[in-house]
């Protein structure tokens, strides 16, 4: 074993913005301090096999597997991955150690597996085994689809950079409004990436994988539709592609469409037009405005004009980071037991949010509906009149938002009692929070009208169970009341409830409900 070289195996993890990675596989730039992979000789293996510790890599991360060989003379090497030979270029560092590197750029499922490195030195041959796995399936991604124009064709390509690779489908609808709901018969789905038929009323592209489904609507201005009362607004992040479609129908072909940004015509190469005749021989024209990667100066009013229709505009706002705008102050509601009521949150967000409603550690699905003014709304009605704390949580790639609601159900108190050798306690969850009275039942007061005021300790809202306040009252036992029946009563504006307790020696206490 003394002839064996001293070898060191390391993992170098590169930060995602490391532009130097991969420029030269021989000299990758180090982004983080290397992590030792503790190459150890594999016992009971034919030949000399070193095994590095298994490596787990985030999806889309870039890494370098590196071997440092302290052996005299030259070395030659070969990488083998999934039965394919990969080029290997050793070099020498300042300590004259042989350095062999394997750069894995933007780690994907297909790059996971066993990497074998065969090294031949003047003294001996040996193999080094690396095992690379995806770090966690929780790190799968599902990204919102975006559009690109197909090269040399009037067609759109839908792209979603997701892991695992998603199924992409176009969702088309030629009706207006509500009839374009997902499961409507007016909706047509096409499971393909390229779409040539771009004249439909409503065009969306959806991508789905193990994580779910994300959709992007093709933003459209229809010059034949009455404009919205508020100007339509489109948000985009810096670097994202901009696509706006302007659509117009006219009795003949004698009309044209143009796009302007802040009263200046769009540059050539930032728009393209298509036209077709519809079944009733009217002419449909569409004019796309597009920017492959938006910058801050692409913000502004985009106006589509026609020689035969009133022009319409949309406000495009380019932001550095996504956002969720809504008021996060907590809200308290007080309702009757059978009153219909829904919580609601109105918000403006980009990109679209994922959200949940939570009550009592249980999560409920969250639906969002777009309003005409650019805001969205999420409502929750499934509270089943259970009092407590309800939480709305929303997040997108860049922002998080949480809003708390408290629901109080107006109802008459209900009393529960318990007793020990030294005290008796009563609890109630009625709302509004009840007040308490204690009464002693005796020969002098068979109707239990003799009020007890000494030794009473009231605790309003002593225990918060998922936001539901519980009020309690405790009576410390004195010789004067030992052996007597006592009655605790809780009352609020909706009524009174009492519980009778026998204060005798320690042991189980009979309770006589008295409502």
């Amino acid at each position: 074993n003394q002839d064996l070289p001293v070898i060191k195996c390391v993992l170098i993890n590169h930060k995602n913005n490391d532009s130097s990675v991969g420029k030269s596989s021989s000299y990758p730039m180090v982004s983080e301090s290397p992590e030792d992979l503790g190459c150890a000789l594999r016992p009971q293996s034919s030949g000399t096999v070193y095994e590095a510790a298994a490596v787990e890599v985030d999806v889309s991360a870039s890494i370098t597997l590196q071997v440092l060989v302290d052996a005299p003379g030259n070395i030659s090497c070969l990488w083998v991955f999934k039965h394919s030979s990969l080029n290997c270029q050793p070099h020498f560092d300042l300590q004259n150690r042989g350095v062999v590197s394997m750069v894995i750029l933007k780690m994907t499922e297909t790059q996971a597996g066993e990497y074998l490195l065969f090294i031949q030195s003047e003294a001996t041959n040996y193999t080094i085994l690396f095992t690379v796995s995806i770090r966690n399936t929780l790190l799968y991604t599902l990204r919102r689809p975006y559009f690109r124009k197909m090269e040399n064709q009037d067609a759109l390509v839908c792209i979603s950079e997701s892991v695992p690779e998603p199924i992409v489908e176009w969702v088309l609808c030629d009706s207006q409004g509500e009839s374009c709901k997902e499961e409507s018969p007016a909706v047509v789905k096409k499971e393909e990436k390229v779409l040539h038929e771009l004249f439909g009323t409503d065009i969306r592209c959806c991508a789905r994988n193990e994580l779910g489904r994300e959709c992007t609507r093709l933003f459209t201005i229809d010059l034949n539709q009455t404009p919205q009362t508020t100007l339509p607004q489109l948000f985009l992040k810096v670097g994202e592609p901009l696509w706006i479609r302007c659509k117009a129908v006219h009795v003949n072909h004698g009309f044209g469409l143009t796009w302007e940004l802040e009263n200046k015509a769009l540059e050539e190469g930032n728009y393209f037009e298509m036209s077709t005749y519809s079944t009733n021989r009217t002419m449909i024209r569409i004019l796309f405005a597009f920017v492959s990667s938006v910058a801050r100066n692409d913000t502004g009013y985009y106006t589509c004009s026609s020689s035969k229709h009133p022009s319409q505009s949309a406000l495009v706002t380019i932001v550095e980071k996504g956002f969720i705008n809504a008021t996060n102050s907590s809200e308290d509601y007080e309702i009757d037991q059978y009153e219909e009521f829904c919580f609601s949150v109105r918000f403006k967000a980009y990109p679209q949010i994922r959200c949940t409603w939570t009550f009592s550690r249980k999560s409920f699905p969250c639906e969002q509906k777009g309003l005409d003014n650019g805001y969205s709304i999420s409502k929750f009605c499934n509270h089943k009149h259970q009092p407590g704390e309800y939480i709305f949580h929303a997040e997108n790639d860049d922002a998080q938002f949480t809003k708390m609601f408290t629901l109080n159900i107006r109802r008459k108190p209900q009393v529960l009692a318990e007793a020990s050798a030294s005290q008796a306690s009563c609890f109630s969850d009625g709302y509004p929070l009840p007040s308490w009275t204690w009464k002693k039942c005796s020969d002098k007061s068979p109707n239990c009208t003799e009020e007890i005021t000494e030794g009473v300790w009231n605790r309003k809202a002593n225990r918060k169970v998922f936001g539901q306040w519980v009020s309690s009252s405790t009576l410390n036992m004195s010789e004067a009341i030992k052996g007597f029946l006592v009655k605790c009563c809780a009352y609020n504006s909706l009524g009174t409830s009492c519980e009778t307790i026998l204060l005798n020696s320690p042991g189980p206490f009979p309770f006589i409900q008295d409502n």
């Epitope: 993992l11 992979l37 503790g38 150890a40 510790a53 298994a54 490596v55 966690n136």
Partner: nanobody, 125 residues
């Protein structure tokens, strides 16, 4: 500093089953990869099984594949090794091991940062 305490070892007949547990205390258990190693009398310590920080990936030595199952419960700070179809050659002191990184899995002894005291498993009729 992490403390690891194994339990569950003992005498078992060939073909029998045993479950080893390793309770961890110290820094957040879920923030590092864990593994099991064993050392038979007169032999070097060898890798048995390892599991990633999240539990999503598992790794086994060829000699135990299909018979042993490694798992972890991050909420209980505990690592497990379920051993079935035990053989005489499985007799050894079993050590629980923790790495110092979420990226490097403890499949070789040099990357182990923390060791347990060990628990003896004897497979004999």
């Amino acid at each position: 500093e992490v403390q690891l305490l194994e339990s569950g070892g003992g005498l078992v007949q060939p073909g029998g089953s045993l479950t080893l547990s390793c309770a961890a205390s110290g820094r957040t258990f879920s923030s590092y990869a864990m593994g099991w190693f064993r050392q038979a009398p007169g032999k070097e310590r060898e890798f048995v099984a390892a599991i990633s920080w999240s539990g999503s990936n598992t790794y086994y030595a060829d000699s135990v594949k299909g018979r042993f199952t490694i798992s972890r419960d991050n909420s209980k700070n505990t690592l497990y090794l379920q051993m079935n179809s035990l053989r005489a050659e499985d007799t050894a002191v079993y050590y629980c091991a923790a790495g110092g990184s979420t990226r490097v899995v403890v499949t070789t002894t040099p990357v182990v940062k923390y060791w347990g005291q060990g628990t003896l498993v004897t497979v004999s009729s």
